[in-house]
């Protein structure tokens, strides 16, 4: 019968040829009376057999990631009679893996949005690398993720590639972060290959800033001839938030005379001081009122940032008009 062990050949051998093993008939007494032949896909081009001894050699570099298994057939013939000594037999040559592929991030580019001020541990995104090496061959395709850039704000779970927040971030200080993640095979041991990817993490706004008046004092003038409803000037607050979190409402906090009103221009986020009652220079030639500003939308959990509304003082001078 046929005698052989299982055949393995390492991929990417840089030698000209590589001895894989021996196929022989147990009737072969070593006197060169038998001839061994190799048939099948790869016979003669990838593998050869020493026709006298049955030794099998790989004669070209193999790539397991291209082909991991070769099924060949062997024949042994008695040279004297030309007859088969054994029935033709099928055998397998397995290409064994070496760590010749680095991890690759296939879903690049990565981008994530996370609310500013999110607590530690908040999940941002999961990145995943793949390795073409054999997952069943040692640690060639076992990956570990690490953070090359992004500390102290982010962390990555070593085995899953899940990126989490590790420190609160303020969008008003920095609104986006580039995080660089490395995936290393061989679970980081010597001889490991690595791949990197970049993740753009954008912070979305939360309403953590209250509007604040640009000036602590505004000076306006109004003609005593101005009709009610006249706009006599504008006041403005600024809010470091964006979008609807920066929308604000102006109102009168203090106006003993009840002469003025403030309406909000929601397009420009300005406060427009309106004459509510006609004024008379001879009766009162100046007024002092206090205005306040608040955000339009403040979720309950963010009320702590909005405890005291910003206020400003408005001095209004009445202009005299000659009367008949």
């Amino acid at each position: 019968g046929w005698v052989w062990n299982q055949f393995f050949v390492p991929e990417e051998m840089n030698t000209t040829s590589h001895h894989i093993g021996q196929l022989r008939s147990d009737l072969d007494n070593g006197n060169n009376s038998f001839q061994y032949k190799l048939l099948g896909a790869g016979a003669g081009s990838t593998f050869i057999i020493d026709e006298r001894t049955g030794d099998i050699y790989a004669i070209q570099k193999l790539d397991r990631e291209e082909r991991s298994l070769y099924i060949l057939r062997a024949q042994v013939i008695d040279i004297a009679t030309g007859r088969a000594v054994e029935p033709e037999s099928e055998f397998v040559i397995k290409v064994s893996d070496i760590n010749d592929n680095e991890p690759k991030f296939l879903d690049e580019p990565y981008e994530a949005i996370v609310p500013e001020m999110s607590p530690e541990g908040t999940l941002v995104i999961q990145v995943t690398a793949s390795d073409a090496d054999d997952p069943s061959s040692g640690n060639n395709a076992r990956l570990l993720y690490s953070l090359l850039q992004g500390q102290p704000y982010f962390s990555v779970e070593p085995t899953t590639g899940v990126i989490r927040i590790s420190s609160k971030m303020d969008r008003e200080l920095q609104d986006e972060y580039w995080v660089i993640i490395q995936a290393k095979d061989m679970i980081g041991q010597p001889g490991a290959l690595s791949g990197t990817t970049s993740v753009l993490i954008k912070l979305s706004d939360v309403n953590d800033n209250k509007p604040i008046f640009k000036e602590s004092l505004y000076r306006l003038t109004v003609s005593e001839s101005a009709p009610t409803g006249t706009s006599i000037g504008t006041i403005m607050a600024y809010d470091n938030d964006i979008g609807e979190n920066a929308e604000m409402d102006y109102s009168i906090e203090e106006d003993d005379s009840q002469t003025f009103d403030i309406i909000t221009n929601h397009e420009t986020q300005e406060g427009i001081v309106i004459l509510k009652k006609k004024v008379d220079f001879e009766h009162q030639n100046h007024y002092g009122i206090r205005a306040k500003v608040k955000n339009h939308h403040v979720p309950e959990q963010l009320m702590k940032y909005h405890t005291e509304a910003s206020t400003t003082f408005i001095k209004i001078q009445v202009e005299d008009v000659d009367e008949p």
Epitope: N14, T16, I48, R52
Partner: antibody, heavy 121, light 107 residues
Framework: EVQLLESGGGLVQPGGSLRLSCAAS????????MNWVRQAPGKGLEWVST????????YYADSVKGRFTISSDNSKSTLYLQMNSLRAEDTAVYYC??????????????WGQGTTVTVSS | EIVMTQSPVTLSLSLGERATLSCRAS??????LAWFQQKPGQAPRLLIY???TRATGIPARVSGSGSGTEFTLTISSLQSEDFAVYYC?????????FGGGTKVEIK
């Protein structure tokens, strides 16, 4: 008896082309690797190129890569070396050599008598 | 590329003397080494392959030894037909490379 007979050598100008042939007999041509080796006047041996049996794999010395092409015709049991963009330093005797068996597959067990290539203007 | 270094360049010996030729590889080539003999005006002839296996028709006075990086060709008793140039060659890695040769001449 294994025999190898080279032909096609001659005088050629720099930049010119030449095609060498090696007619083989006495063995199953497609089962063996074949080689070209050259020897410049008064110098040692230099490997040029190898082709595996059946022609699936080819290998070249850096000095000829991109200029020379090795090929074989199993039906004619003939090995070829197409030489383009020839240079003065390609001047040599060119030998074809048959590969061996098993572990000596990419070896050189039988040699032809050689053919002379002279590159000169 | 594997560099093959042969020594000595020339060996002057008398008939019947023992010739010892050395060949060193720049890195290990296992036993994938061949020795060739070349006489003036002739093609090289294979003497030894696999570092120590004699080719067909090579007399027993010619022997090879060594593995890894150090190899030796020994001719136990020089005959007139042994005076020639001898080359070692590695076939373990591409590109295949030859040593520079050792000339064995009559003293």
């Amino acid at each position: 008896e294994v025999q190898l007979l080279e032909s096609g050598g001659g005088l050629v100008q720099p930049g010119g082309s030449l095609r060498l042939s090696c007619a083989a007999s006495g063995f199953t041509f497609s089962s063996y690797a074949m080689n070209w080796v050259r020897q410049a006047p008064g110098k040692g041996l230099e490997w040029v190129s190898t082709i595996s049996g059946g022609g699936a794999n080819t290998y070249y010395a850096d000095s000829v890569k991109g200029r020379f092409t090795i090929s074989s015709d199993n039906s004619k049991s003939t090995l070829y070396l197409q030489m383009n963009s020839l240079r003065a330093e390609d001047t040599a005797v060119y030998y074809c050599a048959k590969g061996g068996m098993g572990g000596y597959y990419y070896g050189m067990d039988v040699w032809g008598q050689g053919t002379t290539v002279t590159v000169s203007s | 590329e594997i560099v093959m270094t042969q020594s000595p360049v020339t060996l002057s010996l008398s008939l019947g003397e023992r010739a010892t030729l050395s060949c060193r590889a720049s890195q290990s080539i296992s036993s994938n080494l061949a020795w060739f003999q070349q006489k003036p005006g002739q093609a090289p002839r294979l003497l030894i392959y696999g570092a120590f296996t004699r080719a067909t028709g090579i007399p027993a006075r010619v022997s090879g030894s060594g593995s890894g990086t150090e190899f030796t060709l020994t001719i136990s008793s020089l005959q007139s037909e042994d005076f020639a140039v001898y080359y070692c060659q590695q076939y373990n890695y591409w590109p295949l490379t030859f040593g520079g040769g050792t000339k064995v001449e009559i003293k």
